[in-house]
């Protein structure tokens, strides 16, 4: 029994005065607590606790389940204990079958003995299977058997506590060890979409998936630079051992422009943290922005092909697209497709394929697109470059030689005189009059130029060349002159094609 110096409060004394007491099943347990300030007896075994306010604890017919620690406490909070074993050959173990071990920690298999004098108190595998080679344990008859440094590999290990009684091995009920994993990596987090674009009033919902070894992982949605509590819901699954998945869904039922911003899904465990973000942009109404991929003024040579290409952003998604020329809608020759197959794509491409363009096909080509909120359009001015064509070449009544040529860009007309029968004319002749005429065709059609020279300047037989040219090519027409006495005659004018 403990002894203390006089004057100080002392712990209660217990009779019988020993730390351990062994009684047989069916016998009486009689414990007396002596203390002037007696408060209570407490009995503890496994997770069970009982109290008794009498200073004498009497159990008339002891059972194995009366095995445990009996503690007497006084008003000063001082206590004294005795451990009672109720020996029952038919019930050698008291058991609490719940067995949860934290990875890398020790865990107790709770199978205290009712008889401390049995031997070889240890653990055995179920159905004669051996225990893992690295499993170490320490037996304690009053508490159970402590497994040291639990490994993840022990998860769902089937065990028995075992003793030898009269030369025979006796097993307890079976225990299944459940290992709660230690976190040895940060959680794995992912988000359903990296960015969202919504109109005011639409619902914003984004899901974060958190994967870890157990449900103890912490996760939350946060708004960057804000402390506001967000409304989120979650769901979770156990996909077998050490494979836990949680889906945390953040919802804003009616998004506003000022809800725009960056939202972070944050997860952490005892090892560390991880996060992933998503961006929300809320617009007051939809939009369409068109970006021409080529210059909106296009020059193309006669007979060649050209592709008119636009990219455009449309939100919500485009509903109607069309290409128009001269108030006519193209039914074919164009294609429209999303820039990417990404679910959040808002960028599209439209291409109009113009093939073997004729000089008469210049003009304004318009792309129109609309969605439920807005319409937008872009125009391309297409100019078809054509080699000059000499429309008329005449000697006028007033003696002027006149040449009229059409082409695009605007042709230049030069005049040359060749003496005699030479076809190579080099001496240039200055025109008397040059005019650009208004074309009766479309505004993007050929430009018509008229040039005149005075034929009275020519005193000898020869050929006059009218040469019309531009960036695309050149064409010539010829006037042949022959003098008969003092009379000048124009002989058949003719043209010569020059590629």
């Amino acid at each position: 029994q403990p002894s203390v110096s006089p004057g100080e409060p002392s712990p209660p004394s217990i009779h019988p005065g020993k730390s351990d007491l062994i009684v047989r099943v069916g016998d009486e347990i009689r414990l007396l607590c002596t203390d002037p300030g007696f408060v209570k007896w407490t009995f503890e075994i496994l997770d069970e606790t009982n109290e008794n306010k009498q200073n004498e604890w009497i159990t008339e017919k002891a059972e194995a389940t009366n095995t445990g620690k009996y503690t007497c406490t006084n008003k000063h909070g001082l206590s004294n204990s005795i451990y009672v074993f109720v020996r029952d050959p038919a019930k050698l173990f008291l058991v609490d079958r719940s067995l949860y071990g934290k990875e890398d920690n020790d865990t107790l298999v709770r199978c205290p003995l009712t008889d401390p004098e049995v031997t070889n108190y240890s653990l055995k595998g179920c159905q004669g299977k051996p225990l893992p080679k690295d499993l170490r344990f320490i037996p304690d008859p009053k508490a159970g058997i402590m497994i040291k440094s639990v490994k993840r590999a022990y998860h769902r290990l089937c065990l028995h506590c075992s003793v030898d009684q009269e030369g025979k091995s006796v097993l307890s009920e079976k225990f299944i060890l459940k290992v709660r994993p230690a976190f040895k990596a940060v959680p794995v987090v992912s988000v359903s979409k990296a960015s969202y674009l919504l109109r005011e009033g639409e619902e914003f919902t984004v899901t974060c998936t958190i994967k870890d070894v157990s449900s103890s992982v912490y996760s939350t949605w946060k708004r960057e630079n804000s402390q506001t509590k967000l409304q989120e819901k979650y769901n979770s699954w156990h996909h077998g051992d050490f494979n836990y998945e949680r889906q945390a869904t953040l919802t804003i039922s009616s998004a506003r422009v000022n809800d725009s911003g960056v939202f972070m899904c944050y997860a952490n465990n005892t090892f560390g943290s991880a996060n992933v973000t998503t961006t929300l942009e809320v617009v007051d109404k939809g939009f369409i922005n068109i970006f021409p991929m080529i210059n909106t003024t296009v020059f193309v040579n006669d007979g060649e092909n050209v592709d008119l290409i636009v990219e455009y952003e449309a939100f919500p998604k485009p509903e109607h697209q069309q290409w128009i020329y001269m108030n006519r809608t193209f039914t074919d020759k164009w294609e429209d497709y999303p820039k990417s197959e990404n679910e959040s794509n808002i960028r599209y491409v439209s291409e109009l394929h113009l093939t073997r363009l004729k000089g008469t096909e210049g003009g304004t080509y318009t792309f129109l697109v609309s969605n439920s909120d807005v319409n937008a359009a872009i125009a391309f001015n297409v100019y078809v470059n054509t080699k000059p064509e000499i429309l008329t070449y005449d000697r006028l009544v007033n003696g002027m030689l006149q040449c009229v040529a059409a082409g695009f860009p605007e042709p230049t007309i030069d005049w040359y005189f060749c003496p005699g029968t030479e076809q190579r004319c080099s001496a240039s002749v200055l025109p008397v009059d040059v005019q650009t005429l208004n074309s009766s065709g479309p505004p993007f059609g050929k430009l018509v130029v008229q040039s005149s020279i005075d034929s009275s300047a020519f005193k000898h037989n020869g050929t006059v060349e009218c040469k019309a040219y531009n960036d695309v090519g050149k064409t010539s027409a010829y006037f042949n002159f022959a003098f008969k006495g003092n009379n000048k005659e124009q002989i058949h004018p003719h043209t010569l094609f020059t590629p």
């Epitope: 079958r97 719940s98 949860y100 299944i176 459940k178 709660r180 157990s214 449900s215 103890s216 992982v217 912490y218 996760s219 939350t220 949605w221 946060k222 967000l230 409304q231 989120e232 819901k233 979650y234 769901n235 979770s236 699954w237 156990h238 077998g240 949680r246 945390a248 869904t249």
Partner: antibody
Framework: QVQLVQSGAEVKKPGASVKVSCKAS????????ISWVRQAPGQGLEWMGV????????NYAQKFQGRVTMTRDTSTSTVYMELSSLRSEDTAVYYC????????????????WGQGTLVTVSS | DIQMTQSPSSLSASVGDRVTITCQAS??????LNWYQQKPGKAPKLLIY???NLETGVPSRFSGSGSGTDFTLTISSLQPEDFATYYC?????????FGGGTKLEIK
């Protein structure tokens, strides 16, 4: 010994809302998940949802989505369950229960239950 | 959602009888299965958790077994205070679901 103490019985009209509280006495439950389970007269148990300290939100059974909100006030060790747009079939005893046993610490068995709150919906 | 089917829905037995109640899950729930006892006008009480673990203070005549989809609650020797309704509940994934209950009555 932790106990869950719920607010008293309520009588509500259809279309109204009810807010039931569940307070931990004799301890705290800031580190425990709390579920709400209801039982209509003569019927079985029906899980409504859970509020979990390891998640920034709650999990609600599909049947109650949009009508139920569960919140927690750690300073007073109280959780709340609000059910809106009440109808006669919501007449039931509503229990809060602590997830306190089992391998999954936050999703384990209900080891402590409140005494229940009878909510009667009647016009 | 995981459906929990309990059988029988009601059962008459006498004191001292051995009684077995079964619970079947619509998909594998490992051993995340709990059993509760409920008496009229009272809150449910946890008996067994994780299929086979006896809750503290619950008499050892109650035992649970099973894994995967099939589970059993056994009362080895019925006592008068055991006449009540028993529910199983899965904790493998949300939404958590209960069986329909088994009402145990005195024969």
């Amino acid at each position: 010994q932790v106990q869950l103490v719920q607010s008293g019985a309520e009588v509500k009209k259809p279309g109204a809302s009810v807010k039931v509280s569940c307070k931990a006495s004799g301890g705290t439950f800031s580190s425990y998940a709390i579920s709400w389970v209801r039982q209509a007269p003569g019927q079985g148990l029906e899980w409504m949802g859970v509020i979990n300290p390891t998640v920034g939100g709650a999990n609600y059974a599909q049947k109650f989505q949009g009508r139920v909100t569960m919140t927690r006030d750690t300073s007073t060790s109280t959780v709340y369950m609000e059910l809106s747009s009440l109808r006669s079939e919501d007449t039931a005893v509503y229990y809060c229960a602590r997830h306190g046993r089992g391998y999954n610490e936050y999703e384990g068995a209900f080891d402590i239950w409140g005494q229940g709150t009878l909510v009667t919906v009647s016009s | 959602d995981i459906q929990m089917t309990q059988s029988p829905s009601s059962l008459s037995a006498s004191v001292g009888d051995r009684v077995t109640i079964t619970c079947q899950a619509s998909q594998d729930i490992s051993d995340y299965l709990n059993w509760y006892q409920q008496k009229p006008g009272k809150a449910p009480k946890l008996l067994i958790y994780d299929a086979s673990n006896l809750e503290t203070g619950v008499p050892s005549r109650f035992s649970g077994s099973g894994s995967g989809t099939d589970f059993t609650l056994t009362i080895s020797s019925l006592q008068p205070e055991d006449f009540a309704t028993y529910y199983c509940q899965q904790g493998n994934s949300f939404p958590l679901t209960f069986g329909g209950g088994t009402k145990l009555e005195i024969k």
